[in-house]
Interface confidence: medium
């Protein structure tokens, strides 16, 4: 006997009624006296509802089920489940027996929409740039468990410093609490989205935080105007200073260093204590100088990836901030020169001269000239490839037609260090030994 049920799960909202469809094809002359119909939970075999001996035997499932008696004779064995609960979720098997028998299982997927999230801030007043704020996003009474997403005002997903917990209540419905910890910039919008994966229902809320400026004016924070140039592998000091007022103590100081673009925390001093490096353990303050207003940051073993802008936030009673740029540099090696071909050279031959210089940063400027100091710009191809550390290897190729003899010089200039490295080759139109 062929018994048909829907392939896809039946989705039902908590508290509503659901129909679990099941049908069979009655033969001519079929009567209900011949029918045995049993609905049971697939896993536990617990009886849910039955029809036997020509009679509806009623619900064995908390009196919340019913058949469609007027439709049974046409082969409709569907089950109505009333006031759906989370606990009803699962697979139900429909057994039909006339002379032969057949069965099929239908899945019930229970769902409940999440409420619009509420957003809370801690602390929620006297906020200043550089403060660490905990934003909590709470949404209630949903099912199944939610997916939670955060993003900033530019639509960038925020995945770090997020902690999400989901607790089921007595009815099995979930309350979601997601906590985002952020260091405040000048202002910012933070949005939380709670998604019900079954209903594809989105509930979201935003909070915009505008830190207050103190009416008495800001702390003046001073940093160098020019970028700080640091060689790869050396230590760099990002200078930052403020003017402490009489009676100032370190207990009043909040100092935050962060990456200007991404707001990533680099180092902080709060609650009278150095909170340490949040940047690969390569940063340090000058603790003995803080009380005198020296908020400088020491960055050790500088890497190419460190290049960029760092913001120094100082908050006492008032606050102030300033950004300092770090320009990373690495000197280029003395160029090596190669010739191709490198023997049996005659005037009129075309020669390729390659000038190679290694492990510099940033990208080099490459210049060629002949023995008379005349710049050579035609037939020059220069390529610069960065290695895993971000350092560049430079290969510049000059193609020349030989005269009787000639000197060719290549200069590799580091534009930041104003460092010049050069190599020369002298070619005489004689067979080379």
């Amino acid at each position: 006997l062929e018994v048909q049920v829907p392939e896809d799960p039946v989705v039902a909202l908590v508290g509503t009624d659901a129909t679990l469809c099941c049908s069979f094809s009655p033969e001519p002359g079929f009567s209900l006296a011949q029918l045995n119909l049993i609905w049971q939970l697939t896993d536990t075999k617990q009886l849910v509802h039955s029809f036997a001996e020509g009679q509806d035997q009623g619900s064995a499932y908390a009196n919340r089920t019913a058949l469609f008696p007027d439709l049974l004779a046409q082969g409709n064995a569907s089950l109505r489940l009333q006031r759906v609960r989370v606990a009803d979720e699962g697979s139900f098997t429909c057994f039909v027996s006339i002379r032969d028998f057949g069965s099929a299982a239908v899945s019930l997927q229970v769902a409940a929409p999440y409420s619009k999230p509420s957003m809370t801030l801690e602390p929620n007043k006297d906020l200043r740039p550089g403060d660490t704020v905990t934003i909590t996003c709470s949404s209630y009474q949903g099912y199944p468990e939610a997916e939670v997403f955060w993003q900033d005002g530019q639509g960038v997903p925020l995945t770090g410093n997020v902690t999400t917990s989901q607790m089921a209540n007595e009815q099995g419905l979930f309350d979601v609490h997601s906590i985002l910890r952020v260091v405040l910039g000048a202002n910012g919008t933070y949005s939380c989205l709670v998604r019900n994966p079954v209903l594809q229902q989105d509930a979201h809320s935003s909070v915009t935080i505008t830190p207050q400026r103190s009416p008495t004016g800001a702390v003046e924070v001073q940093v160098p105007e020019d970028p700080v140039v640091a060689l790869v592998g050396t230590d760099a000091t990002l200078r930052c200073s403020f003017s402490p007022e009489p009676g100032f103590s370190l207990a009043q100081l909040n100092l935050i260093w962060q990456l200007t673009d991404t707001k990533q925390l680099v180092h902080s001093f709060t609650e009278g204590r150095d909170q340490g490096s949040a940047y690969a353990n390569r940063t340090a303050l000058f603790p003995d100088l803080l009380a005198q207003g020296n908020a400088s940051l020491r960055l050790q073993r500088v890497r190419v990836a460190d290049e960029g802008s760092f913001t120094c936030f100082v908050s006492i009673r008032d606050f102030g901030s300033a950004a300092v740029s770090l320009q990373v540099a690495a000197p280029y090696s003395k160029p090596s020169m190669t010739l191709e071909p490198n023997k049996d050279l005659r005037p009129g031959d075309t020669v390729t001269i390659t000038c190679s210089s290694y492990r510099g940063y940033p990208e080099a400027e490459v210049f060629w000239q002949d023995g008379q100091g005349v710049p050579l710009t035609g037939n020059v191809t220069t390529s610069q490839m960065a290695n895993e550390q971000g350092l560049f290897d430079v290969h510049s190729v000059l193609r020349v037609v030989l005269g009787a003899n000639g000197t060719y010089s290549c200069l590799v200039r580091n534009p930041v260090l104003q460092q010049d490295a050069h190599g020369s080759v002298t070619i005489t139109g004689q067979p080379m030994t």
């Epitope: 997916e147 997403f149 900033d152 639509g155 960038v156 997903p157 995945t159 949005s191 989205l193």
Partner: antibody
Framework: EVQLVQSGAEVKKPGASVKVSCKAS????????MHWVRQAPGQGLEWMGG????????TYNQKFKGRVTMTRDTSISTAYMELSRLRSEDTAVYYC??????????????WGQGTTVTVSS | DIQLTQSPSSLSASVGDRVTMTCSAS?????MHWYQQKPGKAPKLLIY???KLASGVPSRFSGSGSGTDFTLTISSLQPEDFATYYC?????????FGGGTKVEIK
Amino acid sequence: EVQLVQSGAEVKKPGASVKVSCKASGYTFTEYIMHWVRQAPGQGLEWMGGINPASGGTTYNQKFKGRVTMTRDTSISTAYMELSRLRSEDTAVYYCARKGKDYFDWYFDVWGQGTTVTVSS
Amino acid sequence: DIQLTQSPSSLSASVGDRVTMTCSASSSVSYMHWYQQKPGKAPKLLIYDTSKLASGVPSRFSGSGSGTDFTLTISSLQPEDFATYYCQQWSSAPLTFGGGTKVEIK
């Protein structure tokens, strides 16, 4: 009809800068975040960053930090992407692309026709 | 950064074939999006949020997957489907694209 129309092809020398524009029409410019994606010849797609036209806030791919600047002029519904210190590897087609309307739509539903930038000495 | 690896990098198929391509993420992502690009043209959104069909896209395209493994399927390849297909994620910054799968005529 929603459209993003970009400025024409550019040829630049190494070390120079290029500024590409993207004019939006057929929708409210300030309601969608605008991003920039580039594609080198024969290569895949590379995200550069985006700008929120409502606030002017930007987000950049760290690979381009210090070299890329994104701006907008809301009065003419136009976004701009400027790339400085050009090198030969920056030769590519540059696309502006509109992020989906919902705040949490992390994909691009409308693209400009592309602007070819050639960097050559 | 989350790396997206698409396989195969290219495939040859005939009109009417069922075509499947995969996108593997170096760590778990919430959603994957798919684009189609034809030579000399801008990419076009095909599938968003892993399995939702973008406006105007034929139902022969479908997407599936979760975690780190995602699939784009074309149930019956049509002449206009010969193109390069890219996956994209932004569950974690920065936004990244896969290297692409080129679908060519056999």
